[in-house]
């Protein structure tokens, strides 16, 4: 019952004499394991005996019996793993026919037939080509052989026109229940030159011997393959000559359909044949020619033919790299004169006069100068003649103003406060001068272009420079104005002593000034408006208070004189010329007020006074005025004072005070004798007690 069995294997196995066959086979039976397997050659069923008869090539029973003489047949499967693969090695032509696989299980029986085709000689492989081959389009060439056997090694090799193909082929072998084959695949980009060539696939044995082969002729579709020919042979022609160009189609598959011609990439109208003739060529017909031929694959373009029409140089023109050009810059001159062949010699002209030593198409002036300005023209020459000289090109050379100088217009010498006029001059300029600049910049008047008026010129306006300017400024050398001025910065400086001045000191004063022009100066010293000396230094060997006062120094030159700020010279000295004065006179009546004042001359002023009697006894009093109120006859006597400042002390001479009796006292005395006691026992005129009680500040 076929529904119980499922057996898979190739339908037909191919081989040749002496080779081998490998029959891949798998089975499945519903009731499980296979018990018996018999391989028949061309089995036939005997109806009478209800069994198959024929040559038994292999028999697998429970005891594993194999018919004698059939060692070349191997059952590679087994009855457990559903594998029924078998091989016959070697195989012979008479093995052709049917192989019968008799399979018996516990309950089921089956006969499976496999066709075996063994040829006398190795059969050829089959080359398979794609339906269309087109140049440069990659395809895969396939060589297929319906044979493969593990025991018999073979090789497939590709040849093109009998020579092995360089491309690497990939060989695939299949030994499956579906198919048995050996296949070689080759990736190949056919070129137009392969058209009509023979490709061979050779079958080789293990020793490299050719067993069989298959051949195909390549039909490679390609665009037309062209070459272009020119008659006469030269592509260099002279103006007026005739030229014929022929487009040769060396190969085309399929045949070409259209022809056209192009010059410099542009289609030439009404030129549709393989031959192009140009009659009496002109300069404009110089160019690159090619033919374009098309077929169904596409258009093809020939190589370009460069047709050169020779002619004498055309009227020239000069190209200048920059105009106007700046002086000192680099300028390139180029002679443009179309000619074929290119001119071999050039003649240059500057303002119509030939420039010597310049015979090139281009020349350069590295540092252009004003005299290089003018009209430049040129002539070009080639083998066909000398070209016409064109009108020329103008070169304008621009430069900053030249030889800029400055002139002082007013008479010299210049004095501080004068009005000075300066002019700025130059020799030449391109473009014209349009403004002027001045250094230093000041709030100065420019009454006209290039003229500067400095009013009330300063003492320190030492140098002025001007620039004449167009696109650039050119500076003149600065002009020293040499402004004359009276001495400046006149000051009194005390050299000695550096501290305060004391009477008797040596004193040095210096008259300083910061600048003077002219430099020759004279000095004058003044004290309280009176002239003291004419040296830069004023010296006092021993200064006295009488030298104090307001000092200033003057410095003069031929322009004028300048005074310093006044300085008050102060002389410090100890109190001097002390004297005691009495406002009421030196004779005072008793009972009145006696005021003694200590007059002094001191710098700084006296800060402390002392009073003494004729015995040089210090009186306990330190005021400037000694006041005796009421005064007594006993106060009569001589007094002196002493003054002190921070410099020192000074004292007065003695002054005598006489205190006389009042009329009342005299009257009482006449009435009453004066006793000895009245005079008192002391020699001191004024007692401590008296002073204490009677002196009032």
């Amino acid at each position: 019952d076929s529904s119980k069995w499922n057996i898979e294997h190739p339908g037909t196995i191919y081989a040749w004499e002496g080779a081998c066959v490998w029959v891949p086979c798998t089975y499945r039976v519903l009731d499980g394991a296979l018990e018996t397997f018999i391989l028949f050659h061309n089995p036939e069923y005997n109806q009478n005996m209800s069994k198959f008869e024929g040559t038994r090539l292999y028999e697998s029973t429970k005891d594993g019996k194999v018919p004698s003489g059939q060692k070349r047949v191997q059952f590679l499967g087994n009855k457990i793993n559903n594998n029924c693969t078998l091989s016959i090695h070697p195989v012979h032509v008479n093995d052709s026919g049917q192989l019968g696989l008799r399979m018996v299980s516990k309950t089921e029986k089956w006969m499976e037939r496999i066709h075996l085709n063994v040829s006398e000689r190795p059969f050829p492989p089959r080359i398979q080509l794609p339906p269309k081959l087109q140049e440069s389009q990659e395809v895969t060439l396939t060589c297929l052989l319906n044979f493969s056997c593990y025991g018999y090694q073979i090789q497939l090799q590709w040849l093109l026109e009998g020579a092995p193909m360089r491309q690497a082929a990939v060989t695939l072998t299949s030994l499956s229940t579906k198919s048995v084959f050996t296949r070689s695949e080759l990736k190949f980009s056919p070129q137009w030159s392969h058209h009509g060539k023979i490709v061979t696939c050779e079958l080789h044995d293990v020793d490299g011997k050719v067993l069989s082969e298959d051949m195909v002729q390549l039909n490679v579709k390609h665009t037309p393959k062209l070459t272009i020919e020119v008659t006469p042979n030269e592509t260099i022609v002279r103006k007026g000559d005739s030229v014929t160009m022929t487009c040769k189609v060396n190969s085309s598959n399929p045949e070409y359909t259209t022809v056209s011609w192009l010059k410099d990439g542009i289609l030439l109208k009404e030129q549709n044949t393989l031959m192009l003739t140009l009659h009496k060529v002109t300069k404009s017909q110089s160019g690159r020619y090619c033919c374009r031929v098309s077929n169904d694959v596409g258009p093809a373009t020939s190589e370009k033919v460069f047709l050169q029409v020779q002619y004498a140089p055309e009227p020239s023109r000069v190209q200048i790299s920059q105009s106007p050009a700046v002086e000192g810059s680099e300028v390139n001159f180029l002679c443009i004169s179309p000619a074929n062949p290119l001119p071999t010699n050039y003649t240059w002209y500057h303002n119509g006069k030939e420039v010597q030593g310049r015979t090139e198409k281009q020349f350069q002036i590295q540092k252009i100068l004003p005299w290089h300005a003018g009209t430049y023209s040129c002539e070009a020459e080639n083998i066909l003649g000398i070209g016409e000289r064109g009108p020329g090109t103008e070169l304008d050379v621009q430069y900053p103003p030249k030889k800029v100088t400055m002139v002082i217009e007013n008479p010299t010498p210049i004095r501080e406060g004068d009005t000075v006029t300066l002019s700025c001059n130059y020799s030449s300029s391109n473009p014209i001068v349009n403004h002027y600049e001045w250094r230093p910049r000041g709030a100065w008047e420019e009454p006209s272009l290039g003229v500067l008026k400095i009013q009330n010129i300063g003492w320190n306006n030492t140098a002025v420079a001007c620039a004449a300017c167009n696109n650039w400024c050119s500076w003149a050398s600065p002009v020293t104005l040499n402004v004359l001025y009276a001495p400046r910065g006149v000051r009194v400086r005390k050299i000695k002593p550096l501290s305060e001045i004391h009477s008797g000191n040596s004193v040095s004063l210096q008259c300083d000034f910061s600048s003077s022009h002219p430099k020759e100066v004279q000095f004058f010293w003044e004290k309280n408006g009176s002239l003291l000396g004419k040296e830069s230094q004023l010296n006092f060997d021993s200064i006295s208070p009488e030298d104090a006062g307001s000092y200033s120094c003057w410095v003069n030159n031929s322009i004028g004189q300048t005074a310093s700020k006044a300085w008050t010279l102060e002389v410090l000295y100890a109190p001097r010329r002390l004297r005691v004065s009495m406002s009421q006179g030196n004779q005072v009546m008793e009972g009145k007020t006696a005021t003694l004042t200590c007059e002094s001359d001191a710098n700084p002023p006296v800060y402390s006074y002392a009073w003494f009697d004729w015995n040089n006894q210090s009186l306990p009093y330190s005021g400037r005025m000694l006041r005796l109120e009421p005064v007594k006859v006993q106060h009569s006597g001589a007094y002196w004072c002493q003054g002190t400042n921070r410099v020192g002390k000074g004292h007065s001479p003695l002054i005598t005070l006489t205190v006389y009796y009042s009329p009342q006292t005299i009257g009482r005395r006449e009435q009453k004798l004066i006793s000895e006691e009245d005079l008192g026992g002391e020699q001191k005129l004024i007692s401590e007690e008296d002073l204490h009680h009677h002196h009032h500040h």
């Epitope: 000051r491 550096l498 300085w567």
Partner: antibody
Framework: EVQLVQSGAEVKKPGESLKISCKGS????????IAWVRQMPGKGLELMGI????????TYNPSFQGQVTISADKSISNAYLQWSSLKASDTAMYYC??????????????????WGLGTLVTVSS | EIVLTQSPGTLSLSPGERATLSCRAS???????LAWYQQKPGQAPRLLIY???SRATGIPDRFSGSGSGTDFTLTISRLEPEDFAVYYC?????????FGQGTKVEIK
């Protein structure tokens, strides 16, 4: 331009003697006092003394009296500061400066201007 | 001798700020005989002010001095990057002439 140019740096050993100089230019050297000022490393300024090149009158700061000698030679516009026996504590920068000034009103001002760039004296055993 | 005391010892400020430096004398400085100097690292001092308030030649007007007697001030109205330095006051009214110990003005 008024300028004071001082002599170069000195490296000395304790006990050695040294004389550094200060040269004036651009003014009448004889008529201006020259001051010497000490600046010890990382410290402030100390006036050492002053000299009047015109007659070489010198005034010392009491702290420096007897430690140094200040002198001048007006013929070559030079002022000098010298030590007879250096000590490590004399390591300092020494500046000379011109004593400028002017009088007006009742005042007489003085100042140090300009200054020399200084002379570095290093005393080390 | 007159001792001059400067304060503060160090002043940390930013450019553009106002700097006020003080100099106090141990006794009255006669006739405002006081000068101010600037010293930058590795350089000699430079005179800024004399007579307590008179600017020396070439000194920018952002520097000003004031004071009399025993209290004096140097003011920098708007600090420029080049003003960061040490500043010394000095009296020349009494012998020996003396300097303050200095005030360092540094960038904050």
């Amino acid at each position: 331009e008024v300028q004071l140019v001082q002599s170069g740096a000195e490296v000395k050993k304790p006990g050695e003697s040294l004389k550094i100089s200060c040269k004036g230019s651009g003014y009448n050297f004889a008529t201006y006092w020259i001051a010497w000022v000490r600046q010890m490393p990382g410290k402030g300024l100390e006036l050492m003394g002053i000299i009047y090149p015109g007659d070489s009158e010198t005034t010392y700061n009491p702290s420096f009296q007897g430690q140094v000698t200040i002198s001048a030679d007006k013929s070559i516009s030079n002022a000098y500061l010298q030590w007879s026996s250096l000590k490590a504590s004399d390591t300092a920068m020494y500046y000379c400066a011109r004593v400028g000034g002017y009088c007006s009103g009742t005042s007489c001002h003085n100042w140090f201007d300009p200054w020399g760039l200084g002379t570095l004296v290093t005393v080390s055993s | 001798e007159i001792v001059l005391t400067q304060s503060p010892g160090t002043l940390s400020l930013s450019p553009g700020e106002r700097a006020t430096l003080s100099c106090r004398a141990s006794q009255s400085v006669s006739s405002s005989y006081l000068a101010w100097y600037q010293q930058k690292p590795g350089q000699a001092p430079r005179l800024l002010i004399y007579g307590a308030s008179s600017r020396a030649t070439g000194i920018p007007d952002r520097f000003s001095g004031s004071g009399s007697g025993t209290d004096f001030t140097l003011t920098i109205s708007r600090l420029e990057p080049e003003d960061f330095a040490v500043y010394y006051c000095q009296q020349y009214g009494s012998s020996p002439w003396t300097f303050g110990q200095g005030t360092k003005v540094e960038i904050k």
